[in-house]
């Protein structure tokens, strides 16, 4: 089966999509919806998807949700959570996206995609 880590070009695509979201944001992203914060560590792609999948009716992040599914080996459904979540903290989607973007940029700079 495919390797567990996204190759560099795929990671770059995800980063570019997150950049687009942050740059094109006019009104509050997803009407200010709140999502669970996550640990940006191993398994973060599934954790990020598990958190964002609970936001519905927000077209701005639909492509991000879909891209993240390509980095997570198992099916993720709304209401599904793993131990990777910091379940005591909720943040706005906009902040979640910014945090995820900063972390992915760091991984990309460090070459951590092989």
């Amino acid at each position: 089966s495919p390797g567990p880590v996204p190759p560099s070009t795929a990671l770059r695509e995800l980063i570019e999509e997150l950049v687009n979201i942050t740059q094109n944001q006019k009104a509050p992203l997803c009407n200010g919806s709140m999502v669970w914060s996550i640990n940006l560590t191993a398994g973060m792609y599934c954790a990020a998807l598990e958190s964002l999948i609970n936001v519905s009716g927000c077209s701005a992040i639909e492509k991000t949700q879909r891209m993240l599914s390509g980095f997570c080996p198992h099916k993720v459904s709304a209401g599904q959570f793993s131990s990777l979540h910091v379940r005591d903290t909720k943040i706005e989607v906009a902040q979640f996206v910014k945090d995820l973007l900063l972390h992915l940029k760091k991984l990309f700079r460090e070459g951590r995609f092989n």
Epitope: S1, P2, G3, P4, V5, P6, P7, S8, T9, A10, R12, E13, L14, Q65, R66, M67, S69, G70, F71, C72, P73, K75, S77
Partner: antibody, heavy 123, light 107 residues
Framework: EVQLLESGGGLVQPGGSLRLSCAAS????????MSWVRQAPGKGLEWVSA????????YYADSVKGRFTISRDNSKNTLYLQMNSLRAEDTAVYYC????????????????WGQGTTVTVSS | SYELTQPPSVSVSPGQTASITCSGD??????ACWFQQKPGQSPVLVIY???KRPSGIPERFSGSNSGDTATLTISGTQAMDEADYYC?????????FGTGTKVTVLG
């Protein structure tokens, strides 16, 4: 605009070979997995083969394993399907499809399909 | 090998609801997609991730997936919805398409 243009189809005798090409444009080709899907006349859709993005993994349907080879040239934004030992049952319209992103591309959903190229295997 | 089974045909009156089922072992554990194909045209993705609609797909198309069955529902069916519909999933390093369902809009 994302576009996929297949070519290389035609009439070939049983046991013969054919190479299909798919020229892609409008997206970062190297990032995405790509698939070939075929449809025999009056029949349903049948997945043939897939090639992951930069990961380089290939996948085949049992019906073509050992006879067909999928490849890609990211510098030319082109996907290929080399078809050998062709049989009458390989007669179909062959579609090039933009697949998903990432190592688990199959979770994404086949977004964009080409118009297809027709392969006829007959003596 | 993994199989996805659909009814060969479904008939529906304009404005009514059409439901197409897709059955496969533990299909609910996998992401299901649905494609629409009209005569002489390439397939179009109408549902991904069980129930998500790509941009440009009308709201009357919806999907669900649990247990062994995925369902595509067309609410307020229109004449333009007459087409073949295929479900799809990934299993053991291969894509699997359903057998296909022809939706006929009566009248």
């Amino acid at each position: 605009e994302v576009q996929l243009l297949e070519s290389g189809g035609g009439l070939v005798q049983p046991g013969g070979s054919l190479r299909l090409s798919c020229a892609a444009s409008g997206f970062t080709f190297s990032s995405y997995a790509m698939s070939w899907v075929r449809q025999a006349p009056g029949k349903g859709l049948e997945w043939v083969s897939a090639f992951s993005g930069s990961g380089g993994s290939t996948y085949y349907a049992d019906s073509v394993k050992g006879r067909f080879t999928i490849s890609r040239d990211n510098s030319k934004n082109t996907l290929y399907l080399q078809m050998n030992s062709l049989r009458a049952e390989d007669t179909a319209v062959y579609y090039c499809v933009q697949d998903g992103l990432g190592p688990y591309f199959y979770n994404y959903g086949m977004d964009v399909w080409g118009q297809g190229t027709t392969v006829t295997v007959s003596s | 090998s993994y199989e996805l089974t659909q009814p060969p045909s479904v008939s529906v009156s304009p404005g009514q609801t059409a439901s197409i089922t897709c059955s496969g072992d533990k299909l609910g554990d996998k992401y299901a997609c649905w494609f629409q194909q009209k005569p002489g045209q390439s397939p179009v993705l109408v549902i991904y991730h069980d129930s998500k609609r790509p941009s440009g797909i009308p709201e009357r198309f919806s999907g669900s997936n649990s247990g062994d069955t995925a369902t595509l529902t067309i609410s307020g069916t229109q004449a333009m919805d007459e087409a073949d519909y295929y479900c799809q999933a990934w299993d053991s390093s291969t894509y699997v398409f359903g057998t296909g369902t022809k939706v006929t809009v009566l009248g």
